[in-house]
């Protein structure tokens, strides 16, 4: 927890941020909460970014104040105005790009005092993998595909029956650059699979971890996938 210090006789208030990750080409949220005030007009929220001269966003007297906003954030930022009164200073960022990564500061002034906390914001690309049986292959083969990742992830196969087995010798992973020349399509093929087994394709980089599971029996195929963001640390 980072606690802001008091200035000019004012007390310090607690401001809490959570390190988070943004998926490029989506809207992102930079989380920040603070000790609420009873009067909206007494609350000032300033978002700043290390290395950026202008403000990322400013909210004061119950409304946005964007005259000092840096050009790189023009038209892209918003606070949740109806939630400021309950201590939510989180920032919405439109169309996240790689260049949005960095250290942000959430700075709060209320009638109770001042406080701030830093937030480490990572940007990249992550997507859900889909695992399918590759019927075109000569032997029983699984194909795991995920459309967008950045930075380049690692891909690891696992199976329920052969727990702890190393499938690197019987799998092949390729990365194909997408048309926007940043993100990549991930394709991993697993050979010599056996029936009545559950296989997992795990894709991971320093931002996210995603898993695609497939259970193949003689009568049916069951699929499941999930994704989790990494490094969500409160400060």
């Amino acid at each position: 927890l980072i606690i802001g210090f008091g200035i000019s006789g004012r007390h310090s208030i607690t401001v809490t941020t959570v390190a988070s990750a943004g998926n490029i080409g989506e809207d992102g949220i930079l989380s920040c909460t603070f000790e609420p005030d009873i009067k909206l007009s007494d609350i000032v929220i300033q978002w700043l970014k290390e290395g950026v001269l202008g403000l990322v966003h400013e909210f004061k007297e119950g409304k946005d104040e964007l005259s000092e906003q840096d050009e790189m954030f023009r038209g892209r930022t918003a606070v949740f105005a109806d939630q400021v009164i309950v201590g939510n200073a989180s920032l919405r960022l439109k169309n996240v790009q790689l260049t949005d990564a960095g250290t942000y500061k959430c700075y709060i002034i209320t009638s109770k005092g001042k406080g701030n906390a830093n937030l480490e914001y990572k940007t990249g690309a992550f997507s859900m993998p889909e695992v399918n049986v590759d019927y075109n292959a000569s032997s029983e083969t699984l194909r795991c595909e995920a459309p967008r990742w950045f930075p380049q992830p690692t891909v690891v196969w696992a199976s329920q029956v052969d727990q702890g087995a190393n499938f690197s010798e019987v799998s092949n992973t390729s990365f194909e650059l997408n048309s926007e020349n940043v993100t990549m399509k991930v394709v991993s093929v697993l050979y010599n699979v056996t029936i009545n087994n559950t296989y997992s394709c795990m894709i991971e980089n320093d931002i996210a971890k995603a898993t695609g599971d497939i259970k193949v029996t003689e009568s049916e195929i069951k699929r499941r996938s999930h994704l989790q963001l990494l490094n969500s640390k409160a400060s």
């Epitope: 998926n23 490029i24 080409g25 989506e26 809207d27 966003h57 409304k63 946005d64 964007l66 023009r74 038209g75 892209r76 930022t77 918003a78 606070v79 105005a81 109806d82 919405r92 439109k94 169309n95 690309a125 997507s127 459309p147 967008r148 997408n178 048309s179 926007e180």
Partner: antibody
């Protein structure tokens, strides 16, 4: 030059299907939020659908389950597949790029008429 | 659902006069996500103002935007003949993701 050119409109019977295309030049479609916006005769603008840079999609309630937005990154082209068309879908359909600064690039529009 | 209500529905003015168009939201809208468009008959809309007050590229400085929260205004300081058109405000970020106002028709008196 940054430009969007729509095509694929026409006269279609209720219940029919149509696919609109929007060819982009001068910028990369997959780096932007790309939208379809329509305008019924004599009416105002109505947002229809968006495809985010990530490929995720969103729709207005009036077209959800009937319309599908997609893009072909290799062709730098946006599409709108319209199924189960109704008379109230009759409109000029525009594709528009939502850059960071609002919908700053629009196509010329393509007319869809749904009538028996 | 955010509803944008524009007023007046029609505004009749003469060239050289000042035009003030209003856009009121049913709930708070971020200034960053509020835009204004101009549309002439048979043409596609054109972006005028983004972020409530920033002029888009190539837009003359007689056009200005202001406001925050639920009340936004588009002002044309001195009307030129080519300014007579329909004007729409638009918000981003709520459900539905984009919403347009119903439009204000600016006509020659």
């Amino acid at each position: 030059e940054v430009q969007l050119v729509e095509s694929g409109g026409g006269l279609i019977q209720p219940g029919g299907s149509l696919r609109l295309s929007c060819a982009a030049s001068g910028f990369i479609v997959s780096r932007n939020y790309m939208n379809w916006v329509r305008q019924a005769p004599g009416k105002g603008l109505e947002w229809v659908s968006v495809i985010y840079g990530s490929g995720r999609t969103d729709y207005a309630d009036s077209v959800k389950g009937r319309f599908t937005i997609s893009r072909d990154n290799s062709k730098n082209t946006l599409y709108l597949q319209m199924n189960s068309l109704r008379a109230e879908d009759t409109a000029v359909y525009y594709c528009a790029r939502d850059g960071d600064y609002g919908m700053d690039v629009w196509g010329q529009g393509t007319t869809v008429t749904v009538s028996s | 659902e955010i509803v944008l209500t524009q007023s007046p529905g029609t505004l009749s003015l003469s060239p050289g006069e000042r035009a003030t168009l209003s856009c009121r939201a049913s709930q708070s809208v971020s200034s960053s996500y509020l835009a204004w468009y101009q549309q002439k008959p048979g043409q596609a809309p054109r972006l005028l103002i983004y972020g409530a007050s920033s002029r888009a590229t190539g837009i003359p400085d007689r056009f200005s935007g202001s406001g925050s929260g639920t009340d936004f205004t588009l002002t044309i300081s001195r009307l030129e003949p080519e300014d007579f058109a329909v004007y729409y405000c638009q918000q981003y970020g709520s459900s539905p993701l984009y919403t347009f106002g119903q439009g204000t028709k600016l006509e020659i008196k």
